[in-house]
Interface confidence: low
């Protein structure tokens, strides 16, 4: 069960805390570790037995505005001969991340945190076979 | 959501850039989606590059639990169920954004933090370096 929103906090917090209207929070979108870089193995999207392509989605009312999504190239997996083996399946691997969504309402703007599901890459799996009686 | 006034001159002045600090609604959209990869699929066991999932727990972060993938083998599982070392299991990594309480102990003040997580593993053909 989830408890619904409780309204204002009743507690005395440290004096240095910034004042915040009820029902909202202050969010600094200057990112910690902003310059960290992914050091994945080279070209794994092409070298994988379940290769994938990348598509960049862009939305100026989202922060970050660019989100990269992967799409598996094949239904099956690539075998040692470089051919597609449809006895195996290429499947997407997904991960949740947070974004900030900006919404315009007339002359006002509001901000909302949102969880988005990002497809990160693909992996090759043995299929689940359902036998029909 | 929480509304805050836009620039004077609205509606002509369209604010192209996000401000450094914003007030956001506490309610996260899509907050209740399933975050446990063990429950959402069994790919980690069925993959030819299987992985284990390790729970990374940090109560000063949202989400407080993140699952990290560690490839089980250097090689990949072949059709006979054996590890084939002619292929490599490698982690697929992704940068994600999380919330970090800042300043510490302030209940309604956060900063976005970028963290690198290994989400799963994939089987790749190795890069072979030939020594002259």
């Amino acid at each position: 069960r989830k408890i619904p929103k409780v309204g204002h906090t009743f507690f005395q917090k440290p004096e240095s805390c910034p004042p915040v209207p009820g029902g909202s929070m202050k969010l600094d979108i200057g990112i910690i570790n902003e310059n960290q870089r992914v050091s994945m193995s080279r070209n794994i999207e092409s070298r994988s037995t379940s290769p994938w392509n990348y598509t960049v989605t862009w939305d100026p009312n989202r922060y970050p505005s660019e989100v990269v999504q992967a799409q598996c190239r094949n239904l099956g997996c690539i075998n040692a001969q470089g051919k597609e083996d449809i006895s195996m399946n290429s499947v997407p691997i997904q991960q949740e991340t947070l974004v900030v969504r900006r919404k315009h309402q007339g002359c006002s703007v509001s901000f909302q945190l949102e969880k988005v599901l990002v497809t990160v890459g693909c992996t090759c799996v043995t299929p689940v076979i359902h036998h029909v009686q | 959501g929480i509304t805050i006034p836009r620039n004077p001159g609205c509606p002509n002045s369209e604010d192209k850039n996000f401000p450094r600090t914003v007030m956001v609604n506490l309610n996260i959209h899509n907050r209740n989606t399933n975050t446990n990869p063990k429950r959402s699929s069994d790919y980690y066991n069925r993959s030819t590059s299987p992985w284990n999932l390790h729970r990374n727990e940090d109560p000063e972060r949202y989400p407080s639990v993140i699952w990290e993938a560690k490839c089980r083998h250097l090689g990949c599982i072949n059709a006979d169920g054996n590890v084939d070392y002619h292929m490599n299991s490698v982690p697929i990594q992704q940068e994600i954004l999380v919330l970090r309480r800042e300043p510490p102990h302030c209940p309604n003040s956060f900063r976005l933090e970028k963290i690198l997580v290994s989400v799963g593993c994939t089987c790749v053909t190795p890069i072979v370096h030939h020594v002259a």
């Epitope: 929103k5 029902g23 | 727990e57 109560p59 407080s64």
Partner: nanobody, 119 residues
Framework: EVQLVESGGGLVQPGGSLRLSCAAS????????MYWVRQAPGKGLEWVAE????????YYVDSVKGRFTISRDNAKNSLYLQMNSLRAEDTAVYYC????????????WGQGTLVTVSS
């Protein structure tokens, strides 16, 4: 699986005392702030008390300050609420809740224990 089980509620006369307990399992108890939340009949939820991970800081809603004491035993994965000088307006279902970093939300909470203050 995360579980929170409250106990210790009951009928008590005004001015009396009760001690509520909450047994926690399925998560690293010592890593989380814990809360007592109550819901009076026909009313909304009210955050009663918070205790930090190591028990060093406690916070209370004004109406219970000086009467209620929140405590925890991390070795036993247990949370407590000592309620003294009880008043009729303390009548409510009391819930134990595990804190998430996002304020005003709890990701897990128990089934509740009813406290009735009446003469």
């Amino acid at each position: 699986e995360v579980q929170l089980v409250e106990s210790g509620g009951g009928l008590v006369q005004p001015g009396g005392s009760l001690r509520l307990s909450c047994a926690a399992s399925g998560f690293t108890f010592s890593s989380y702030s814990m809360y007592w939340v109550r819901q009076a009949p026909g009313k909304g939820l009210e955050w009663v008390a918070e205790i930090k991970q190591d028990g060093s800081e406690q916070y209370y809603v004004d109406s219970v300050k000086g009467r209620f004491t929140i405590s925890r035993d991390n070795a036993k994965n247990s949370l407590y609420l000592q309620m003294n000088s009880l008043r009729a307006e303390d009548t409510a279902v009391y819930y134990c809740a595990k804190g998430e970093i996002l304020p005003l939300y709890f990701d897990y909470w128990g089934q509740g224990t009813l406290v009735t203050v009446s003469s």
